[in-house]
Amino acid sequence: APTSSSTKKTQLQLEHLLLDLQMILNGINNYKNPKLTRMLTFKFYMPKKATELKHLQCLEEELKPLEEVLNLAQSKNFHLRPRDLISNINVIVLELKGSETTFMCEYADETATIVEFLNRWITFCQSIISTLT
């Protein structure tokens, strides 16, 4: 059974992930972002189901495309280099899902824009955090 300290650690990691995703979304939605139209042409795979930490596998599998899109954005829209942001997310995701068994992600048939993709994972983080608090 998870201890209170492991639950707290999970909560903090989810909050960190949430902040990183929100930072990316805010940087993209910045009204001064001239690359937004181009960024919205990139398609992302959405998870069929995202209700447990193991489903973060689906986010992990989209990190490289996410980095590619962020590289289009003006760097001043972000506090960190896109690569550093994505690497931070990579480390947190691995820590959070960290299970022995490999979970094979199932994707929805419809692809999504980067904004829809980020909103989906932001909602996921918020939902899991709410169950921990």
Epitope: E61, E62, K64, P65, I86, S87, N88, L94, M104
Partner: antibody, heavy 118, light 108 residues
Framework: EVQLVQSGAEVKKPGESLKISCKGS????????IGWVRQMPGKGLEWMGI????????RYSPSFQGQVTISADKSISAAYLQWSSLKASDTAMYYC???????????WGQGTLVTVSS | EIVLTQSPGTLSLSPGERATLSCRAS???????LVWYQQKPGQAPRLLIY???SRATGIPDRFGGSGSGTDFTLTISRLEPEDFAVYYC?????????FGGGTKVEIK
């Protein structure tokens, strides 16, 4: 279970060409980088380069740029490392590994021993 | 490129003892990019620690990583017989990805 299975050991002569393979299974092959690492006899690890099978984006270490070619065939979940003209100094164990975006090599193949000798 | 220097080159210890391995970088980078591997003779390397301090799946908690900037440490709190091996640090803070020269932990 994530697995990377490499092709068997090779014995070649200087000047010959060679292509070794790495087949991935148990995960979405197109969503992760595959890296190649050289280990010369009794020596440490050297990163050669990476390929992202999803779009064939390839990056090389400056030390290996122009010396080898990294490629992939996503239809069969395979990555390749090839030489057009081998040298005796290419004798080494070559490993493929799945590489996360932050750089950690989390799953490794068993290695392919390449021996180049006249 | 970032050069990683590992010390000592060889560490001679007995089972049950504590091992402290050092990895020093020629320039500073985010700890997200620091990784440790273990390699036993005739085997492929195995991921131990990523993000400087996070244990990989299935790695016992006697293995611990710490550090930031240019100085990183791998600690094995109590050496087990199966821990005698070569340990490599690795960075990807900037391209190319580089490895340290390795530290061999041998039985005293």
């Amino acid at each position: 279970e994530v697995q990377l299975v490499q092709s068997g050991a090779e014995v070649k002569k200087p000047g010959e060409s060679l292509k070794i393979s790495c087949k991935g299974s148990g995960y979405r092959f197109t969503s992760y980088w595959i890296g190649w690492v050289r280990q010369m006899p009794g020596k440490g690890l050297e990163w050669m380069g990476i390929i992202y099978p999803g779009d064939s984006d390839t990056r090389y270490s400056p030390s290996f740029q122009g010396q080898v070619t990294i490629s992939a065939d996503k239809s069969i979940s395979a990555a390749y490392l090839q030489w057009s003209s081998l040298k005796a100094s290419d004798t080494a164990m070559y490993y493929c590994a799945r590489q996360q975006v932050a750089g950690m090599l989390d799953y490794w193949g068993q290695g392919t021993l390449v021996t180049v000798s006249s | 490129e970032i050069v990683l220097t590992q010390s000592p080159g060889t560490l001679s210890l007995s089972p049950g003892e504590r091992a402290t391995l050092s990895c020093r970088a020629s320039q500073s980078f985010s700890s997200s990019y620091l990784v440790w591997y273990q390699q036993k003779p005739g085997q492929a390397p195995r991921l131990l620690i990523y993000g400087a301090s996070s244990r990989a799946t299935g790695i016992p908690d006697r293995f611990g990583g710490s550090g930031s900037g240019t100085d990183f440490t791998l600690t094995i709190s109590r050496l087990e017989p199966e821990d005698f091996a070569v340990y490599y640090c690795q960075q990807y803070g900037s391209s190319p990805l580089t490895f340290g020269g390795g530290t061999k932990v041998e039985i005293k």
